[in-house]
Amino acid sequence: MSSKYPRSVRRCLPLWALTLEAALILLFYFFTHYDASLEDQKGLVASYQVGQDLTVMAAIGLGFLTSSFRRHSWSSVAFNLFMLALGVQWAILLDGFLSQFPSGKVVITLFSIRLATMSALSVLISVDAVLGKVNLAQLVVMVLVEVTALGNLRMVISNIFNTDYHMNMMHIYVFAAYFGLSVAWCLPKPLPEGTEDKDQTATIPSLSAMLGALFLWMFWPSFNSALLRSPIERKNAVFNTYYAVAVSVVTAISGSSLAHPQGKISKTYVHSAVLAGGVAVGTSCHLIPSPWLAMVLGLVAGLISVGGAKYLPGCCNRVLGIPHSSIMGYNFSLLGLLGEIIYIVLLVLDTVGAGNGMIGFQVLLSIGELSLAIVIALMSGLLTGLLLNLKIWKAPHEAKYFDDQVFWKFPHLAVGF
């Protein structure tokens, strides 16, 4: 039988997406211009390379990392690219409106593209919890709401807590994880009889998911150092992230083997756990003074990630309807929290050392920032979940969850493609 989009979605999606794109083009026309200053070209190339690393992480890394479902791999990769492209456009405008707009025009620089790519990455992390259960029209809504929520969170944190680019962007892990989990909680959960095979992983898609993990692993130092303002900070961030992800790989593979009764290694554990160190070290990557500390953090993060992958999927599947292989949400929620806690511990150690009330005040501010990030993530995630449940989006029927054939044209239409 021929698989097509439902007729209503065929009308709704192109109209919705293209109208939105036209609106974005108009906004860019009226409100933006390029930075006209003459730059040192060598500096320009170096600056572009960081943005390129982030784009590779987003498009290839997160795109392929989510592609391990047996019958939903095409959609995972392509929908990720779609969301990235849309998210970057909206994030550039939003960041400009929130930070630059009093001057009348939003100036687009390579740095603003860098910020926008990182904001869009948030959506790609969150969407892991709902991919396969939503169509593109719903994903457009998710992109718009999440990028807007993150942009406003960053602005509020900047203004209230006086937090710089790096620190307020590093809430992305916790924000994206809790946003995604709360959206998933709102969506129809039980998988009907006969679709259990679709959310299982297959060898070739699992290999492409591993490829995604490798790209993320390679470029995570660029992500953690992208918004730091001095060469010394960036150098330390790169080194510490590298040591942390290196140790988390070793921990992930050996920990996965340890967690299995026959000592076998789980692909799913490895996909996510290899990144554990990078997430855990993110907030304080520039503050860690020596490799051994970063390595200890990588070890702890790897163990938490493998432990989480072993014990949390059952709970997440029951409560949130998240399949066993979509473990980025709870993984990042645990590791993001670990990263934030590490930063707070550093501040607490300062307080103990200095006996300074002002540092104690900074500890409270940091706890406030983290709490605000979680609250806004949960609230905006629930709002998004409720929006996605509206009938107008023509969500895929539960029987069509995790099925590429609902969205893609396959010449042969074989079940085992």
Epitope: G43, T163, Y165, S230, P231, H286, M358, Q362
Partner: antibody
């Protein structure tokens, strides 16, 4: 020794443009952020703009945003300030200053230092009809 | 609009001690504002004295010290010399807005 020399100041009519330069010597210019600071006659110091060491990010005071553009050419060890749509209130001595880079570390964390350390002697800009 | 406030003027006797303060309209000043202090004499460019709350430059005389006092940044001059007569500016970093803001300056008179 470390030195910053500003140039390009002068008398200009309101609404016109002017470009200031700051030539740096005695240090590795490409690894330092740079600032422009101004001081109106008989007034205090006012921070104008900053550019990161690699030119990737620029930030401006609200009073000049949209009119002034900070840039740098690391191959020429030079910092620039392009001033457009000049107003009478932009009359001031303009200083370039080097962004401070420093840190110390304890066994468990690094502490970074921010600020400005080296200043030029300034160049005077007068906006008058 | 963020405002950084300093005492407009202070007078001190030679050999005495004086403390200049720097407050932010956004609330308590913490080390996260990286308070800097500068000295400017008439007709000269500003000269950096203190950075990141309490750190001295190699050229800063030992009698100058920086600290945080009751939610404000403070510059203390102990054993004031006649040549310390100048205008002193504090500078705070607002990381969230990526802005630096100078205080209005304190004119220190040594009588």
């Amino acid at each position: 020794q470390v030195q910053l020399v500003e140039s390009g100041g002068g008398v200009v009519q309101p609404g016109r443009s002017l470009r200031l330069s700051c030539a740096a010597s005695g240090f590795t210019f490409s690894t330092y952020g740079m600032h422009w600071v101004r001081q109106a006659p008989g007034k205090g110091l006012e921070w104008v703009a900053v550019i990161w060491y690699d030119g990737s990010n620029k930030n401006y005071a609200d009073s000049v945003k949209g009119r002034f553009t900070i840039s740098r050419d690391n191959s020429k060890n030079t910092l620039y300030l392009q001033m457009n749509s000049l107003r009478a209130e932009d009359t001031a001595v303009y200083y370039c200053a080097r962004d401070l880079q420093g840190y110390r570390s304890s066994w468990y964390r690094m502490y970074y230092y921010y600020g400005m350390d080296v200043w030029g002697q300034g160049t005077t800009v007068t906006v008058s009809s | 609009q963020t405002v950084v406030t300093q005492e407009p003027s202070l007078t001190v006797s030679p050999g005495g001690t004086v403390t200049l303060t720097c407050a932010s309209s956004t609330g308590a000043v913490t080390s996260g504002y990286y308070p800097n202090w500068f000295q400017q004499k008439p007709g000269q460019a500003p000269r950096a004295l203190i950075y990141s709350t309490s750190n001295k430059h190699s050229w800063t005389p030992a009698r100058f010290s920086g600290s945080l006092l009751g939610g404000k940044a403070a510059l203390t001059l102990s054993g004031v010399q006649p040549e310390d007569e100048a205008e002193y500016y504090c500078l705070l970093y607002y990381g969230g807005a990526q802005r630096w803001v100078f205080g209005g300056g304190t004119i220190l008179t040594v009588l």
